[in-house]
Interface confidence: medium
Amino acid sequence: APVPPGEDSKDVAAPHRQPLTSSERIDKQIRYILDGISALRKETCNKSNMCESSKEALAENNLNLPKMAEKDGCFQSGFNEETCLVKIITGLLEFEVYLEYLQNRFESSEEQARAVQMSTKVLIQFLQKKAKNLDAITTPDPTTNASLLTKLQAQNQWLQDMTTHLILRSFKEFLQSSLRALRQM
């Protein structure tokens, strides 16, 4: 598995460097997860032709994946730090069940899938420390998540491949959009 952020050889070789700020640590964590997603997407694309599927075909899939919208306060127009932070944390919490689904979907990148899942948990902790209004963050219902997981795992092979591809793509886009927003904070 790849080395988690803050433990790469460059950091070890340069102990005199300034400690990372909270923002830099979050940035590094997100980029580490994005690197993991890239590796998982490679395996998915090599294994099936889902990556060539048109966006329209993918949009027909009825997965309720988190997505940023204007009202979430994360875009430059109408930016609202606290509303946006709540959206990012809530979205990441909602992605957790989908990341759990990914755990048995990879052969050669099994460790990578686990690393993405665990690193996301760490990222949520970093962001929760940054948030002032933790009460506004809604945690997904475990029973609902469990039944969703069962439903996803019961799909036929083609739909499972489609779901895997869609989760990875949506998670990547959500993280990239979060990065854009977090850099304004």
């Epitope: 700020t21 997505k67 940023m68 875009f75 127009s77």
Partner: antibody, heavy 120, light 106 residues
Framework: EVQLVQSGGGLIQPGGSLRLSCAAS????????MIWVRQAPGKGLEWVSD????????YYADSVKGRFTMSRDISKNTVYLQMNSLRAEDTGVYYC?????????????WGRGTLVTVSS | DIVMTQSPSTLSASVGDRVTITCRAS??????LAWYQQKPGRAPKVLIY???TLESGVPSRFSGSGSGTDFTLTISSLQPEDFATYYC????????FGQGTKLEIK
Amino acid sequence: EVQLVQSGGGLIQPGGSLRLSCAASGFTISSNYMIWVRQAPGKGLEWVSDLYYYAGDTYYADSVKGRFTMSRDISKNTVYLQMNSLRAEDTGVYYCARWADDHPPYIDLWGRGTLVTVSS
Amino acid sequence: DIVMTQSPSTLSASVGDRVTITCRASQGISSWLAWYQQKPGRAPKVLIYKASTLESGVPSRFSGSGSGTDFTLTISSLQPEDFATYYCQQSWLGGSFGQGTKLEIK
């Protein structure tokens, strides 16, 4: 062939409006970051705006905020820069470019540029 | 906006020289920095991205380093085709450029 073809430049009076177009071929703008960069005569490069494909989220430099609008037409695979309330200091070559879909992004593809001259 | 300050503005050097251009950001930008080369009448081309990653097809005499606020572009042994203007660009927030460094023949 992967390329960006620009059009829409020209001579315009101060206070006027102009729309620049940038047609992409060989890739889809619906899954790529796009960016506009300008260069005043004999000067350096200045980032103007960018558009992130996810939800069409746009960012603008302070110098153009409120006057310029970046948009896209996915069916035409084209991005636009609508420039209003133009000033003499907006004169220059405007480049349409693509951010590489990486983290961090960088510009991996440029248009040839189109000249905008704001003068009375 | 994040302000990028490049130095020097002009640099005179000879073929075979080792040259270094520096770029400083007004706030921490992690490794969200790229270096571009521009020749007169042409669009710029990327040399280095992610502060130190060499773009495919770019000669290995070009190298980049730095993180946070201070960055450098080094050309280990100048070639005739390297005389041009060089720009740094941050992509942490927006995409502001440094003012450029014109590398000219001594």
